[in-house]
């Protein structure tokens, strides 16, 4: 089935994430809360009234309010998760689908430059689908993915800021660049 009503959720590799059930409040009528990882149709965590909570492995934790915590996210945790909540009569009172996408956090971007030909480079080494932005004295100059190369001509002294970001993280570096009139390294 094509998932059209999934809640897109982003998690950072190696970090924990909580999958919170929107507009749900625990009540006495709730008999069963079941979380499934749909790619292999496997039940991964379950709360049942007056029964021991089930966890398929220790990286999962199920809170009393139905929230599922996945600890130390790995790439194979990227999946579509389904939570089903049932009352004492077996009625499916709430069902939510979570499309969990995982990214590696971006590293701090590195700014380097050469005064010989007034060229500046900003580069990010790590991170999934990073977006790089370069600013000169607060003005946006360029947008790229992993590397930005910029030749500046307006002034030999300027403050450059480079930001790297993705869905799960944001890092930035600032470098005041000053070059002598003759253009020496």
């Amino acid at each position: 089935k094509e998932i059209t009503n999934a809640l897109e959720t982003w998690g950072a590799l190696g970090q924990d994430i909580n999958l919170d059930i929107p507009s749900f409040q625990m009540s006495d009528d709730i008999d069963d809360i079941k979380w499934e990882k749909t790619s292999d149709k496997k039940k991964i965590a379950q709360f049942r009234k007056e029964k021991e909570t089930f966890k398929e492995k220790d990286t999962y934790k199920l809170f009393k309010n139905g929230t599922l915590k996945i600890k130390h996210l790995k790439t194979d945790d990227q999946d579509i998760y389904k939570v089903s909540i049932y009352d004492t009569k077996g009625k499916n009172v709430l069902e939510k689908i979570f499309d969990l996408k995982i990214q590696e956090r971006v590293s701090k971007p590195k700014i380097s430059w050469t005064c010989i030909n007034t060229t500046l480079t900003c580069e990010v080494m790590n991170g999934t689908d990073p977006e790089l932005n370069l600013y000169q004295d607060g003005k946006h100059l360029k947008l790229s993915q992993r590397v930005i190369t910029h030749k500046w001509t307006t002034s030999l002294s300027a403050k450059f800021k480079c930001t790297a970001g993705n869905k799960v993280s944001k890092e930035s570096s600032v470098e005041p660049v000053s070059c002598p009139e003759k253009g020496l390294d």
Epitope: N5, K34, K43, K51, S84, G90, K91, N92, E95
Partner: antibody, heavy 117, light 107 residues
Framework: EVQLVESGGGLVQPGGSLRLSCAAS????????MSWVRQAPGKGLEWVSY???????YYPDTVKGRFTISRDNSKNTLYLQMNSLRAEDTAVYYC???????????WGQGTLVTVSS | EIVLTQSPATLSLSPGERATLSCRAS??????LHWYQQKPGQAPRLLIK???QSISGIPARFSGSGSGTDFTLTISSLEPEDFAVYYC?????????FGGGTKVEIK
């Protein structure tokens, strides 16, 4: 009173298609998970497909890609579209209302599907 | 896939006798096991859910026990209408497989 009534069974040639229906009454149909289960002549029970209250579907490998379960909550009806039918699909097909953990609480009377040339 | 093995395949008993039916799972399924009764020409009927929970409308002579991999359905004193085929079903994980069935016949 909960009632499930299947229809649409019959004789079909190998490779053919058939759509089964299950009319539900006596309960809030849209709020319950539903399944189709089949039983080949003189054999045991085999679960065929599942649809959650919200429309999420699961299939076993034996029918995946050939069978499609769907529901029309406005008509209180469950469907099973069966394509590329094989002789081994010959069975009585039951629709059932299930609980939280696959327990099949209410069953229809079944409809016979015969795949033969 | 969880495989359920029922034994014996056939149980020949007289009315009034006690019937003990076994179901063994290939891996632990906690108490996620359900029992059904099926009579010829009829749809199955849920007898017991979660290994031991009784179902409304089912006579008290039917009881279930077990957890993990070994489960038992007991009929304390067989009535003529109890002669049928009994199936166990895995309710723990996908796919929700059934056992091969035990036929309880009149001796």
């Amino acid at each position: 009173e909960v009632q499930l009534v299947e229809s649409g069974g019959g004789l079909v040639q190998p490779g053919g298609s058939l759509r089964l229906s299950c009319a539900a009454s006596g309960f809030a149909f849209s709020s319950y998970d539903m399944s189709w289960v089949r039983q080949a002549p003189g054999k045991g029970l085999e679960w065929v497909s599942y649809i959650s209250g919200g429309g999420f579907t699961y299939y076993p490998d034996t029918v995946k890609g050939r069978f499609t379960i769907s529901r029309d909550n406005s008509k209180n009806t469950l469907y099973l579209q069966m394509n590329s039918l094989r002789a081994e699909d010959t069975a009585v097909y039951y629709c059932a209302r299930q609980g939280a953990n696959w327990e099949l609480v209410y069953w229809g009377q079944g409809t016979l599907v015969t795949v033969s040339s | 896939e969880i495989v359920l093995t029922q034994s014996p395949a056939t149980l020949s008993l007289s009315p009034g006798e006690r019937a003990t039916l076994s179901c063994r799972a290939s891996q632990s399924i906690s108490d996620f096991l359900h029992w059904y009764q099926q009579k010829p020409g009829q749809a199955p009927r849920l007898l017991i859910k979660y290994a031991s929970q009784s179902i409304s409308g089912i006579p008290a002579r039917f009881s279930g026990s077990g957890s993990g991999t070994d489960f038992t359905l007991t009929i304390s004193s067989l009535e003529p209408e109890d002669f049928a085929v009994y199936y166990c079903q895995n309710g723990h994980n996908f796919p929700p497989t059934f056992g091969g069935g035990t036929k309880v016949e009149i001796k």
